[in-house]
């Protein structure tokens, strides 16, 4: 039975040209996290594996940095970065947990962080 929940940074906004940290946290389970995959819509951005460490997709290497922790830092943001991001936690023995973050990249300087929320 999967008892865990993923807490994410939820709906967030950031300024064009700036950077943002995408963060997920798995709680309420004793399952071992073996790997976390980060995806943007239909693109694999990065993988953090418990044994192998980080792999950043080559096409994102210039603008994506690993961490902090299992999170992901997006740099030099453009309006095209607006959209859904997913953290996919592969765990043993529970299976897979998925968290969703929506990022809006704004032209102006009025970007503010959204509230944290939980996905069961």
């Amino acid at each position: 039975m999967m008892t865990g929940t993923i807490e994410t940074t939820g709906n967030i906004s950031a300024e064009k040209g700036g950077s943002i940290i995408l963060q997920c946290h798995l709680s309420s389970t004793t399952a071992q996290v073996t790997q976390v995959n980060w995806e943007q819509q239909d693109q694999l951005l990065a993988i953090c594996n418990a044994d192998l460490g980080w792999h950043i997709s080559p096409s994102f290497k210039d603008r994506v940095a690993p961490g902090p922790g299992l999170g992901l830092t997006l740099q030099s943001l453009t309006v095209n970065d607006t959209g859904e991001y997913f953290c996919i936690y592969h765990t043993y023995p529970d299976g897979t947990y998925t968290g969703r973050i929506f990022l809006e990249v704004l032209e102006s300087s009025v970007a503010e962080h959204g509230a944290r929320f939980q996905i069961p």
Partner: antibody, heavy 118, light 107 residues
Framework: EVQLLESGGGLVQPGGSLRLSCAAS????????MHWVRQAPGKGLEWVSG????????SYADSVKGRFTISRDNSKNTLYLQMNSLRAEDTAVYYC???????????WGQGTLVTVSS | DIQMTQSPSSLSASVGDRVTITCRAS??????LNWYQQKPGKAPKLLIY???SLQSGVPSRFSGSGSGTDFTLTISSLQPEDFATYYC?????????FGGGTKVEIK
């Protein structure tokens, strides 16, 4: 240099058993998921089974479930495939493969031929 | 199970030609799509992983694109050593599945 060397193939009668081995070297074996993929003569590639880096999680193709068992001994840097109740349609070259991040196969062994025939 | 459909099953081309091979998944697989090259009597070799990432040591004339259900492998200028069979493979979910292969032959 990464090397994967399969052994244990051969001729076996239908209903018989074989145990394939794959000796790994040149990398930290215990850090990688490993898979078996087979190829029947003149045919395409078919995934057979996979195992996580610590051996705690395994998966199988429906065509071999209940007959084949994948295992590994990280202290010996060796991957195994125990094949029971073999059928003629199991005849193939069996490749062991390294699967970083459980996403792609970056190294393959040279393969070992299993022939099931009476 | 996710079905992978490759086309064409075979093609004839000349050295220097631009060659395109397509692979379609029966459901969305994000970018969990890999391409392999296999020559007769040899093990497959990884060319492209995660839809568009070029494996280290693979010539830049090979490129991959696509996401979701439709993917493409392109060889920008076919070389003599490129005549082989090419397979796509999804790693979105188990069972992992391969396309039926595309044999690239000399015209």
């Amino acid at each position: 240099e990464v090397q994967l060397l399969e052994s244990g193939g051969g001729l076996v009668q239908p209903g018989g058993s074989l145990r394939l081995s794959c000796a790994a070297s040149g990398f930290t074996f215990s850090s990688y998921a490993m898979h078996w993929v087979r190829q029947a003569p003149g045919k395409g590639l078919e995934w057979v089974s996979g195992i996580s880096s610590n051996g705690g999680s395994t998966s199988y193709a429906d065509s071999v479930k209940g007959r084949f068992t994948i295992s590994r001994d990280n202290s010996k840097n060796t991957l195994y495939l125990q094949m029971n109740s073999l059928r003629a349609e199991d005849t193939a070259v069996y490749y062991c493969a390294r699967v970083p991040y459980a996403v792609w196969i970056d190294y393959w062994g040279q393969g070992t031929l299993v022939t099931v025939s009476s | 199970d996710i079905q992978m459909t490759q086309s064409p099953s075979s093609l004839s081309a000349s050295v220097g030609d631009r060659v395109t091979i397509t692979c379609r998944a029966s459901q969305s697989i994000s970018s969990y799509l890999n391409w392999y090259q296999q020559k007769p009597g040899k093990a497959p070799k990884l060319l492209i992983y995660a839809a568009s990432s070029l494996q280290s040591g693979v010539p830049s004339r090979f490129s991959g694109s696509g996401s979701g259900t439709d993917f493409t492998l392109t060889i920008s200028s076919l070389q003599p050593e490129d005549f082989a069979t090419y397979y796509c493979q999804q790693s979105y979910s188990t069972p992992l599945t391969f396309g039926g292969g595309t044999k690239v032959e000399i015209k």
